[in-house]
Amino acid sequence: WELTILHTNDVHSRLEQTSEDSSKCVNASRCMGGVARLFTKVQQIRRAEPNVLLLDAGDQYQGTIWFTVYKGAEVAHFMNALRYDAMALGNHEFDNGVEGLIEPLLKEAKFPILSANIKAKGPLASQISGLYLPYKVLPVGDEVVGIVGYTSKETPFLSNPGTNLVFEDEITALQPEVDKLKTLNVNKIIALGHSGFEMDKLIAQKVRGVDVVVGGHSNTFLYTGNPPSKEVPAGKYPFIVTSDDGRKVPVVQAYAFGKYLGYLKIEFDERGNVISSHGNPILLNSSIPEDPSIKADINKWRIKLDNYSTQELGKTIVYLDGSSQSCRFRECNMGNLICDAMINNNLRHTDEMFWNHVSMCILNGGGIRSPIDERNNGTITWENLAAVLPFGGTFDLVQLKGSTLKKAFEHSVHRYGQSTGEFLQVGGIHVVYDLSRKPGDRVVKLDVLCTKCRVPSYDPLKMDEVYKVILPNFLANGGDGFQMIKDELLRHDSGDQDINVVSTYISKMKVIYPAVEGRIKFS
C-alpha cells in the first residue's frame, strides 16, 4: 500500500508568493511559493495519486503583515481552502498567547491540530479541551493512518504560551500515544511535529512504532540529487534513521516559508512496515501557475493589508541582509541597522557629563526574520519591516552588570554553527570571539562604547560596572536561553514597539546604507 505525504513547515505567514530568499516578491516571473501556487501543485498530485495526505509541521503563524493584520484568521481560512489533513502546533502558534491560538485557529480549523506533549492545566484545561489533540487517525483510501503531534518543549522560552500549558519531553509524551494507536490496530503512524531536526531524528530512533517523522522548526532542507535553488541540503531526502528496534525510519522536513512542498512516497507492507521511501521537496517556482480561485481570494484579503502598510517610510541604497545564514552566524547589516535605530530611539541628552544615557544594543539574530532587497527602487515600507520584525515585541531599556553581559556574549556562541537564534547582533559594542576555545570561554575581547564622554570611544567592559542596554523584550524575559539577563537584570523599563522604532528611524534618515563594519569579529 502506497502513501504520498505532502508536507510544509515554518511557512511563517508567506501566503503570497515571495522572492527566492522568501522576502517580498519583487519580480513576479521569478517568485516562488504562496498558497495559490501550493494549491495548484497539491491538487495536481491529489488527482494523479490515490492516497495523499497534506500535513503541516507548525509555525504557520508570524512572519509578514498578513499575520500582523489578520492574527491567524488567514491561516485557518487558507489552510481550510487547501484542505490540509492535519497540522502540528509550532512554537510561534503561541505568539499572541493562548487566546490568539484558540479563537482564530483552533476554533476555525476544519482539520485536526495536534500536539501530544502539550498538557493544559488550571482554568485553561476545559477551555482548550478537544481543540487540539495528541493524535488523529485519518482514513486514507481503504486504510487508516495515525498522525501524532509534538511541539518544541522550548516553546515557553520562544513564545507566549502562558502558565497553564505544560510542554513535556517529546519522546516521553509520544510513546504512550503511539502505543495507544497500536491498540487501535493502527499500524501506519506518522509523527508530525515542530521540535527541530535533531529531535526529529531522536523521535525516529527512540519512539517505538513511529514509521515516518515529518518535522519543522529548524528550517532543515533535505534533498537527494542536485538542489534546485540556493538552499544547501543538510542531508538526503528522506533522511533515514535506524531505530533502536532496528527499523529504517524516514525523517523529512521541507525548509521553510512555503518555498518547497515536501513530497514523500512511502510503501507499506500489509503489517504496516515501511518497505520503501523516496521523494524530494518540490520547488514551488513560477513554472507552477498560481490557482486562480485561491489567488482571487488572496487579492480580496490583501485589500485590508494594502491600506495598512504600503506607504514608503524611506529608502535603502544597499541590500539589507536579514538572512538567517548571515544574522545567526556573523555581523549582518540588518542587525546593525536595527541596533542603530534602537539607540537612536533612546537618545536622551539630559546630563552634560553624558552624550547619552545609553550606548549599547544587543539583538538576537533569530529575531531578524527577513532581508530587504534594495532593487525595488530602494523602497522600504511597514510591510517590509513587518517581515523583518514580525513578532510585535518592544525594544526595552535594562540595566545589567558587565559580568551579565559577558555571560550573554558567551551564550551567544556557546553552540555556534547550528543556525540558532541566540547569536547576538550589536550596537555600541565590539566583540571578538575565538571559536577554537571551549563554550563558555570564547569571548576574547569585549569593548563597549562609553557614555560618560564627549567623544564616544570603545573601552573594555568592566565586570562590576552597571551598564544600560537596549534590547528586545524577548531577551529581557530570558528568551533564546538568555536566562542570565532575566535573572540578573537590575532594572527593566518597557520600550516602544520594535517595527515602530525602526520605521521611525528610517523615516528620520530618509536614505539608509548600513554596513558591516567590524562590530563582531572572530580571531
Partner: antibody, heavy 119, light 107 residues
C-alpha cells in the same frame, strides 16, 4: 441530525443466533466506528466490539471472540451484529453506538434492542 | 483489561445538593475518560469526554476533573432531571471498559 435506528426486540432459544441491525443517518457513515454495547437487566454496560465501515476493520472484546460477528453494508449505511450460541446470560439490551476511530467514547446511541434468551 | 471502579454505587441526595462521583482506573488512562448519564429504559447519553470536555447541550453544572487513575464527576447543584445512573468509561486501552455505575436517587 445523527440518528441510529436499531431493529426490534427478539426472543431466542438457547443455542440459537440473533442478528441485530443498526441503520445510521445524518453523518458520513464511513468515517466513524460503530460499537456494540450490551446491558443485562439491572446491570452495567459491557463493550462487545466495533467495526469501522471505512475499511471493514473489526475489534472484538476477548470475551465474545468466536461468538460475535459484525458486518457492514455501506450501500444502506447499516451495521449488523450477530451473536451465536446464545445462552440465558446473553439476555440483554444491545446498543449500537457511534465513536471516533481514534477516541472511542460514544457520542450517539441507538435506542437499544432487547434480546431475550429463554427456553 | 483495565478495571474501572466507580463509587459510590448509589447515593441519595436532594435538589440543590452538590454531588461527587469518583472513578478509579486500575492503571493510567491518560485522561481518556468519558461520563454517561442513563435514565431507566433509555440509552446512555454522553456528558463529558476527555475528562473535562462538556458535550454540546449538557448543562454547565456538570464538570469533570482528575488525571492518571483517579477521576471525578461533579454535579454542582442537583436538579430533578439529574436523578439517573452515571457511568464512567475508559477509552485508553481495548477493550473499552465501563465503571459499575452510580445510581443517584432522591433523598
Amino acid at each position: 441530525q445523527v440518528q441510529l435506528v436499531q431493529s426490534g426486540a427478539e426472543v431466542k432459544k438457547p443455542g440459537a443466533s440473533v442478528k441485530v441491525s443498526c441503520k445510521a443517518s445524518g453523518y458520513t457513515f464511513t468515517t466513524y466506528n460503530m460499537h456494540w454495547v450490551r446491558q443485562a437487566p439491572g446491570q452495567g454496560l459491557e463493550w462487545m466490539g466495533a467495526i469501522f465501515p471505512g475499511n471493514g476493520h473489526i475489534s472484538y472484546a476477548q470475551k465474545f471472540q468466536g461468538r460475535v460477528t459484525m458486518t457492514v453494508d455501506t450501500s444502506t449505511s447499516t451495521v449488523y451484529m450477530e451473536l451465536s450460541s446464545l445462552r440465558s446470560e446473553d439476555t440483554a439490551v444491545y446498543y449500537c453506538a457511534r465513536g471516533d476511530y481514534d477516541e472511542s467514547y460514544f457520542d450517539y446511541w441507538g435506542q437499544g434492542t432487547l434480546v431475550t434468551v429463554s427456553s | 483489561d483495565i478495571q474501572m471502579t466507580q463509587s459510590p454505587s448509589s447515593l441519595s441526595a436532594s435538589v440543590g445538593d452538590r454531588v461527587t462521583i469518583t472513578c478509579k482506573a486500575s492503571e493510567g488512562i491518560y485522561n481518556r475518560l468519558a461520563w454517561y448519564q442513563q435514565k431507566p429504559g433509555k440509552a446512555p447519553k454522553l456528558l463529558l469526554s476527555g475528562v473535562i470536555s462538556l458535550e454540546t447541550g449538557v448543562p454547565s453544572r456538570f464538570s469533570g476533573s482528575g488525571s492518571g487513575t483517579d477521576y471525578t464527576l461533579t454535579i454542582s447543584s442537583l436538579q430533578p432531571e439529574d436523578f439517573a445512573t452515571y457511568y464512567c468509561q475508559q477509552y485508553w486501552s481495548i477493550p473499552w471498559t465501563f465503571g459499575g455505575g452510580t445510581k443517584v436517587e432522591i433523598k
